[in-house]
Amino acid sequence: TQNKALPENVKYGIVLDAGSSHTSLYIYKWPAEKENDTGVVHQVEECRVKGPGISKFVQKVNEIGIYLTDCMERAREVIPRSQHQETPVYLGATAGMRLLRMESEELADRVLDVVERSLSNYPFDFQGARIITGQEEGAYGWITINYLLGKFSQKTRWFSIVPYETNNQETFGALDLGGASTQVTFVPQNQTIESPDNALQFRLYGKDYNVYTHSFLCYGKDQALWQKLAKDIQVASNEILRDPCFHPGYKKVVNVSDLYKTPCTKRFEMTLPFQQFEIQGIGNYQQCHQSILELFNTSYCPYSQCAFNGIFLPPLQGDFGAFSAFYFVMKFLNLTSEKVSQEKVTEMMKKFCAQPWEEIKTSYAGVKEKYLSEYCFSGTYILSLLLQGYHFTADSWEHIHFIGKIQGSDAGWTLGYMLNLTNMIPAEQPLSTPLSHSTYV
């Protein structure tokens, strides 16, 4: 007679990442009896919600349920029905919603209320929707990549199971770039963290970690572009903005009201003698880089050293995983290889930005023009942020690893968030039982 497979004893969890530009739903799976082991949780599905970020629904809150339907339905299909009721669902909103809350707490609450009501309609165990702090976003991203890289495991291995593994327990730093904010998180070397706001203490798997983190609101790639435009239009002599961060021949009309819609441009706001202006691309990397540097105030630092805008940053230490838009942008530009030096990246960016817009459109016909037009800025911004903002050098550039996935799971804050909320990262090292670990590799 045929052997019948025993039903898998597995658990599932769902996290929705409500970012500034879009929402993604992640489904995670793990063996029920190994909940406290490190590295057992893995992503089985990512469903990117088709549409903008939830903060864009502020005037159409009643439609948030429609917007979320397809991916929630996908979760119903992927997760066995018998598991639905015990599958936790968490939604974390990041900087797009932080900005909306700055503008109007009432509107942000209304969006979250509708999100909660919509998600409560599904057969899962909905655990709430909230705006996570920048500190949490940085911390959970750091936990995610180190969990997936096996850095919390106490067992030393003679073989490498994951890329980037240096076969030691030195954790990786985390560099996260979104549309509206960017996070830097790492364990400094024997350095006191001079600003309490940037200090985190964790005890994970029996080991203490003193972690530095900071989230720069308004320094995600989309908001940084708005900042740059608002800064540059101040000194434009008329309604034409010749912009080195866009390809030669590129033209786009921008409404001044759109430019000043975000709290991120408030510091540059002024009364302009026109309602619209036209961006005309001139495609010059060096000038674009110079313009971006003006967004970083490096003239003031109340600590031993700073990143920018008076924010403490300890000396960089160890390897870093750069993910989310750091990865997507560099992947598009074909610059994620470990072998590409910082000088080569700069060289490639110079060439890319100088390419005529018509040529670019022909080469990348399948990419929406709005996104395609911004890769020159985004690539230049990444270089500026990493080199001048965070003080990476040509030498330390090789310690940055542009990471999309690790072991099939997306690098980002969502896995760390779920691990924390489901209490799956114990403070102490779990005792090995003969059943849960084999004696031999």
Epitope: K50, G65, I66, Y67, D70, K368
Partner: antibody, heavy 122, light 111 residues
Framework: EVQLQQSGAELVKPGASVKLSCIVS????????INWVKQRPEQGLEWIGR????????KYDPKFQGKATMTSDTSSNTAYLHLSSLTSDDSAVYYC???????????????WGQGTTLTVSS | DIVLTQSPASLAVSLGQRATISCRAS??????????MNWFQQKPGQPPKLLIY???NQGSGVPARFSGSGSGTDFSLNILPMEEVDAAMYFC?????????FGGGTKLEIK
């Protein structure tokens, strides 16, 4: 501007197969779902199915399962509908379409291809 | 499958007047607090065009004279005031469950 450009009219023999294409421009095909809809002369609309080009996931009307296969190629921003074992009942106009939210604003809009006329005749 | 029955099959309305088209589903098309009913317009030789989604929301660029209402199994599309360009076929469509289905259509003409 979002556009869906469908391949030209097809005249095929019964029993043969055909692959219709739908080239998307103005947005990334991965950022939407592509639906296929059949319309016979002077008749109503029939939904064949939908594909998510981001991951290849599909949903079909069971009556088109085995008859129709939807695929997509994200590198060329193109969706395809493959129809097999053709009979005169398959003679129709086939539309590709997207409807849903724009990826920048919360605007819900639709875009349709101009339709491909398929004639099955010996 | 969810069967959608449209009525009337054809309708003639004077310019400036109200046109009302009904659509009845064989079972509820509501789920998760949403009515998964859409309305499309089609003119001869053209592809359909989305007018209303989720029972009552206007598609982008759709004139305000088009409105939708209803929940559960009974839905209607209203056009007020009727204009010459509105003469067309109208189809209801449910996307609650696979297979998604369309109604048989209503031909709207000018009286």
């Amino acid at each position: 501007e979002v556009q869906l450009q469908q391949s030209g009219a097809e005249l095929v023999k019964p029993g043969a197969s055909v692959k219709l294409s739908c080239i998307v421009s103005g947005f990334n095909i991965k950022d939407t779902y592509i639906n296929w809809v059949k319309q016979r002369p002077e008749q109503g609309l029939e939904w064949i199915g939908r594909i998510d080009p981001a991951n290849g996931n599909t949903k079909y009307d069971p009556k088109f399962q085995g008859k129709a296969t939807m695929t997509s190629d994200t590198s060329s921003n193109t969706a395809y509908l493959h129809l097999s074992s053709l009979t005169s009942d398959d003679s129709a106009v086939y539309y590709c379409a997207r409807w849903g939210y724009d990826d920048e604003e919360a605007d819900y809009f639709d875009s349709w291809g101009q339709g491909t006329t398929l004639t099955v005749s010996s | 499958d969810i069967v959608l029955t449209q009525s009337p099959a054809s309708l003639a309305v004077s310019l400036g007047q109200r046109a009302t088209i009904s659509c009845r589903a064989s079972e509820s098309v509501d789920n998760y607090g949403i009515s998964f009913m859409n309305w499309f317009q089609q003119k001869p030789g053209q592809p359909p065009k989305l007018l209303i989604y989720a029972a009552s929301n206007q598609g982008s660029g759709v004139p305000a004279r088009f409105s939708g209402s209803g929940s559960g199994t009974d839905f209607s599309l209203n056009i007020l005031p009727m204009e010459e360009v509105d003469a067309a076929m109208y189809f209801c469509h449910q996307s609650k469950e696979v297979p998604w289905t369309f109604g048989g259509g209503t031909k709207l003409e000018i009286k």
